[in-house]
Every structure is written in C-alpha cells, then in structure tokens.
C-alpha cells in the first residue's frame, strides 16, 4: 500500500522559517504534488504549492521555495513575516497524485517540543485516500 510521509521542521538559523518535507513511498509514477495548509487539499486547506515532475513548481505566499528533492520527495520552505509564528500550530498536508494508484494525502505539523533545526520524525497521521 502506498504511503505519504510529512515532516515539518523549524530552521535553526531563522525561527520564522519552516520547511515542510513530503515523500511518497510506493510504486507508480508521481504526476502531481499539492501542498496545502490548514487542512487537506479541497477540504478547507489553502494551497501553498503545486509541483509537477516535468512542468515545474509553483508556490504562493507564505511559501518561499518549492523544490523536488528526489523523484518521490519534495520540500517547501516557508517564511513567516508576522511577529508571532502561526506555522507552529498549523497542519500541513501533502497530496501525491500517482499513476496508477490514484491520489494519496497525509498531514503533519511541527511537534510541540521540537528544537529548532532538529528534524521531527514523520507524523503518524492517517493516510487519506482522495479518490
């Protein structure tokens, strides 16, 4: 069964900067990745980035840089311009559309006790079958 993992980390150098890492574990080829915050894509979440393996990446504020890390994982850097950091309590969701499996989505957030710069383990959130 395919799985999606999500990992959120705070940057050690800039406490207002966060990075979301997502990956797809399973067979098939990835056709699109969508990253949203505040909830799953299409269920109240706000799109932060769209990554297509051949057409390229797009991102919108507060996302700063979306990129492919490997053929099956991506990263999204976020910059919080506000005085307080809303990212700390926010859920980030990554949806991977793959062929022929369909769409798989998982969500994660920054662990409450995580130290800046330390990678949080993948959050064990149930994987949602989108289709």
């Amino acid at each position: 069964t395919p799985e999606v993992w999500v990992q959120v980390q705070m940057e050690a150098t800039e406490l207002s900067s966060f990075t979301v890492h997502c990956g797809f574990l399973g067979p098939g080829s990835i056709s699109l990745v969508t990253v949203s915050w505040g909830g799953p894509d299409g269920a109240g979440g706000t799109k932060l980035a769209v990554l297509h393996p051949e057409l390229g990446t797009r991102q919108w504020a507060p996302a700063r840089q979306a990129r492919w890390e490997t053929q099956s994982s991506i990263s999204l850097a976020l910059e919080d311009s506000g005085a307080s950091s809303p990212f700390a309590n926010t859920t980030f969701c990554c949806k991977f559309a793959s062929f022929p499996e369909g769409s798989w989505e998982s969500c994660g957030s920054l662990p409450p006790s995580s130290d800046p710069g330390l990678s949080a383990p993948p959050t064990p959130v149930p994987i949602l079958r989108a289709d």
Epitope: W60, A61, W68, E69
Partner: antibody, heavy 114, light 113 residues
C-alpha cells in the same frame, strides 16, 4: 473544453488605470492557478505574475510590481489584472494563461494614447 | 533572472525540410533532485495566442504532431521539426520553467519558402 475569455480592447490615456478580466470555463476555477503575460507589438513574451484562486496571494515579476495588481473573483470564475500609471510603454496585448501556460486566453489589446 | 537566448532570430525553409532552432539559458534548467529539465517550447501563429508544444525539454503536449521534437539539457536546448509543413509558419519561443520569474526567449520566426 477549457476556455479563457478575456475582456475587449482598451484605449486609455497616459497616467490612467485599466482593469482587464479573464473568465474561465470548462474546469474548476479554484483548482488551477492563473498567469498573466504581456506581449508588446512584434516583441517577445513577458511574465507579469500568477495567482491561485485558492490562495489569493499573487507572485509578481519584480519588473511589474507596482504596475500590475492581480485578483480573482471565485464566484464568477474570473481573474482580473489592474494596470496603473499607464504609459505608451504599456501598450501591448495582455494574455491570461491557466496552469503551466497550457491554455491561453484570447488576449486583450491595451493601447495607451492621448 | 534567467536570460533565455534563441537563435536564429528567423529562418526560411521549404516544406518538407528539417529545421532546428536553439535556445540557451543563462543558468542551468536542470533540477538536481529529480534530474528533470524545466524548459518549455511554444508556437505562436500570426494573430493567435501562444500554444504549448513541449514541456520538460522533451515531452510533447497532447495533440502535438510527432514531427516536433525537443532535446537538450542544462543550458542548451533544441527544437527540431523533422519535416516542416506550411501550417508550421509561426514564431517559436522557449521558456524557463525552472525558477521565478518565468522568462521567455526572444523567439525564432519560421517562414516557409
């Protein structure tokens, strides 16, 4: 069929502003982002910016910051671009293009002349 | 910003001939993470908006004839039309799809003799 229908030609005076529209049909408007591109007469293409209806925070080409403002009307499936402080240099055809520039609008000709 | 340079600026060929046009970028368009090149080619016929022909440097958009082929990697890319048809009269643009702001080349105008 995905279609982007743009508003008609505009003749505006220098210093004025203009707001052009791009009505999308044939797909779920909030699923895809929208680009705006300028093509001056006989010249190449310049990307102005993009906006996702689901996010609302546009990205701008630095060259067009302060010149263009991108917005969306989700209920009407329409994207808008306002151009201000127009000069003759802004006379061009302006296109909207959805997603990864895979579907383009019909184009709106803006002529700035006194 | 990534600067895209196309050559030649124009060329004139007879129907049935093979045509190649070049596009060079000022920075690499290769993503090291997934080893994909983010370059697209567009065709703009007179009085029409541009049409996406090729993305990912070499993948043809649905419905595009197989006489159009994209190749190249890094900073050097080529669009080849194996056997030019009269309806291929157009300006061809390459585009950086690697990083903001998205930038286009100056275009290559293809004329049919």
């Amino acid at each position: 069929e995905v279609q982007l229908q743009q508003s008609g030609p505009e003749l505006v005076k220098p210093g004025a502003s203009v707001k052009i529209s791009c009505k999308a049909s044939g797909y779920t408007f909030t699923d895809y982002f929208m680009n705006w591109v300028r093509q001056s007469h006989g010249k190449s293409l310049e990307w102005i910016g993009d906006i996702h209806p689901n996010n609302g925070s546009p990205n701008y080409n630095q060259k067009f910051k302060g010149k263009a403002t991108l917005t969306v009307g989700k209920s009407s499936s329409t994207a808008y671009m306002e151009l201000r402080s127009l000069t003759s240099e802004d006379s061009a055809v302006y296109y909207c293009a959805t997603g990864y520039f895979d579907v383009w609008g019909t184009g709106t000709t803006v002529t700035v002349s006194s | 910003d990534i600067v895209m340079t196309q050559s030649p600026s124009s060329l004139s060929v007879s129907a049935g001939e093979k045509v190649t046009m070049s596009c060079k970028s000022s920075q690499s368009l290769l993503n090291s993470g997934n080893q994909k090149n983010y370059l697209a080619w567009y065709q703009q016929k007179p009085g029409q908006p541009p049409k996406l022909l090729i993305y990912g440097a070499s993948t043809r958009e649905s419905g595009v004839p197989d006489r159009f082929t994209g190749s190249g990697s890094g900073t050097d890319f080529t669009l080849t039309i194996s056997s030019v048809q009269a309806e291929d009269l157009a300006v061809y643009y390459c585009q950086n799809d690697h990083s903001y702001p998205w930038t286009f080349g100056g275009g290559t105008k293809l004329e049919i003799k």
